[in-house]
């Protein structure tokens, strides 16, 4: 009775529970041959399985984290716009982060991620969870690159103070550099937060998506020598 393929770690008990239910429901359908489970019950198994995985995903508080993600993205965006205004009005050399414009396109990505996470938290369909997972993985990668860019940007730009000194701090050069560095530091901090949130949401999304069994389930009925292989059809897009 207990022959089946497992796609999740042993500690993930949802699948085991689903299988136990399946074994309990196993009955021979009249005229269907010995030991073949009723196909109607398969949907119940899928639904039961997805319910458990949904709970796993919702445990990650996607709605709350999604809102936080959007708020951080908006803060980062406003920082970026302010930095650009300060830099362009100061007429000098700007931090690398201003040239790259990460705060603009990075924030857009995080807003999309956050929105998908909220949507997936409200209507936990596989499509939305998949979309949220994909965007959050992308956002994690983006956040890492942003952390690197901002670290380099801050380090290098700090040396611009030297050029301010050369001309005797013209047009409050030191003040401008300090403001831009402070904002760059804030963007760096926000990028770290974005990374933590995106990774956390990705982890919970992955628990729900990656732990969906897509393999073959072998049901060996006790009253038959014949083992029938019943492939699990994809879970219904609820």
């Amino acid at each position: 009775h207990q022959t089946y393929r497992r796609h999740c770690r042993p500690e993930e008990s949802t699948f085991s529970a689903a299988m136990t239910t399946m074994q309990g429901m196993e009955q021979a359908t009249p005229g269907a041959g010995p030991g073949v489970p009723q196909l109607g019950n398969m949907a119940v198994v899928h639904s039961h399985l997805w319910k458990g995985l949904q709970e796993k995903f919702l445990k990650g508080e996607p709605k709350v984290l999604g809102v936080v993600q959007i708020l951080i993205a908006l803060m980062s965006l406003s920082m970026g716009i302010t930095m650009m205004c300060v830099a362009f009005s100061a007429y000098g050399h700007y931090p690398i982060s201003v040239y790259i414009g990460y705060t603009i396109w990075g924030s857009v990505m995080f807003i999309i991620s956050g929105s998908l996470s909220i949507a997936a938290g409200i209507r936990t369909t596989k499509g939305l969870v998949r979309g949220s997972l994909g965007m959050n993985i992308t956002s994690s990668v983006l956040a890492v690159s942003a952390i690197l860019i901002n670290t380099i940007s801050l380090t290098i730009y700090s040396f611009y103070h030297r050029y301010c000194n050369y001309y005797g701090n013209p047009n409050n050069c030191h003040g401008t550099v300090s403001i831009l560095m402070g904002m760059d530091g804030m963007v760096l901090l926000l990028s770290v937060l974005e990374f933590c949130i995106a990774v956390s949401l990705s982890a919970f999304g992955c628990k729900a998506i990656c732990c969906t069994p897509g393999g073959v389930v072998l049901i060996i009925p006790s009253n038959s020598h014949m083992a029938e292989a019943a492939p699990l059809t994809p879970l219904n897009e609820v």
Partner: antibody, heavy 124, light 111 residues
């Protein structure tokens, strides 16, 4: 590419004034200091001063305060130097040059691009 | 102001040989671990052209035969091997502090 185009030769009377121009192209004019350098025939190079077209800041060497007035027009990406109360010792070639800045663990700044120069002749 | 003294005032070198021009500053031009010494080449009727910045870094498009060295107050420009096209005036310039100042120049000719 980065280019600095200077105005043509000037012939002036002693006591008169001349305004030299330096039109920049190929870079963001408002982000770099523009330098002005004097070279008398067969002599060395002498820094006059610098102007930042972006914020309008200027720096002069002591010798040229009152003699040279630096300015810039952002709309036409042109830097200007006015030389007043001309005397025979003001006869020289005047260059404009852009100052490039490289900052990092090792920071540098240097005059990387120069104009062809404007010859000013003061003669009665 | 920092005074730069170049030597020799003129120099004649055979083709393929090494030319060395010296520049001494009245005070150190080092700052932030960098030597703010630049070298320029000027041919008759032309503006100066940047050869070396930061004492030893080559300007863009400058042939490898031009090299700079030194720190503090003593610097030198080396040209090896000497080519016909290298006949020109050479100037050192400090950018440690405003006003930037230039050396008196060295006239390099072919022997």
């Amino acid at each position: 590419q980065v280019q600095l185009q200077q105005s043509g030769a000037e012939l002036a009377r002693p006591g008169a004034s001349v305004k030299l121009s330096c039109k920049a192209s190929g870079y963001t004019f408002t982000n770099y200091w523009m330098q002005w350098v004097k070279q008398r025939p067969g002599q060395g190079l002498e820094w006059i001063g610098a102007t930042h077209p972006g914020h309008g800041d200027t720096r002069y060497t002591q010798k040229f305060k009152g003699k040279a007035t630096l300015s810039a027009d952002k709309s036409s990406s042109t830097a200007y130097m006015q030389l007043s109360n001309l005397a025979s010792e003001d006869s020289a070639v005047y260059y404009c040059a852009r100052e490039e800045v490289y900052y990092g663990f090792r920071s540098y700044w240097y005059f990387d691009v120069w104009g062809a120069g404007t010859t000013v002749t003061v003669s009665s | 102001d920092i005074v730069l003294t170049q030597s020799p005032a003129s120099l004649a070198v055979s083709l393929g040989q090494r030319a060395t021009i010296s520049c001494r500053a009245s005070e150190s031009v080092d700052n932030y671990g960098v030597s703010f010494m630049n070298w320029f080449q000027q041919k008759p009727g032309q503006p100066p052209k940047l050869l070396i910045y930061g004492a030893s870094n080559q300007g863009s498009g400058v042939p490898a035969r031009f090299s700079g060295s030194g720190s503090g107050t003593d610097f030198s420009l080396n040209i090896h091997p000497m080519e016909e096209d290298d006949t020109a005036m050479y100037f050192c310039q400090q950018s440690k502090e405003v006003p930037p100042t230039f050396g008196g120049g060295t006239k390099l000719e072919i022997k």
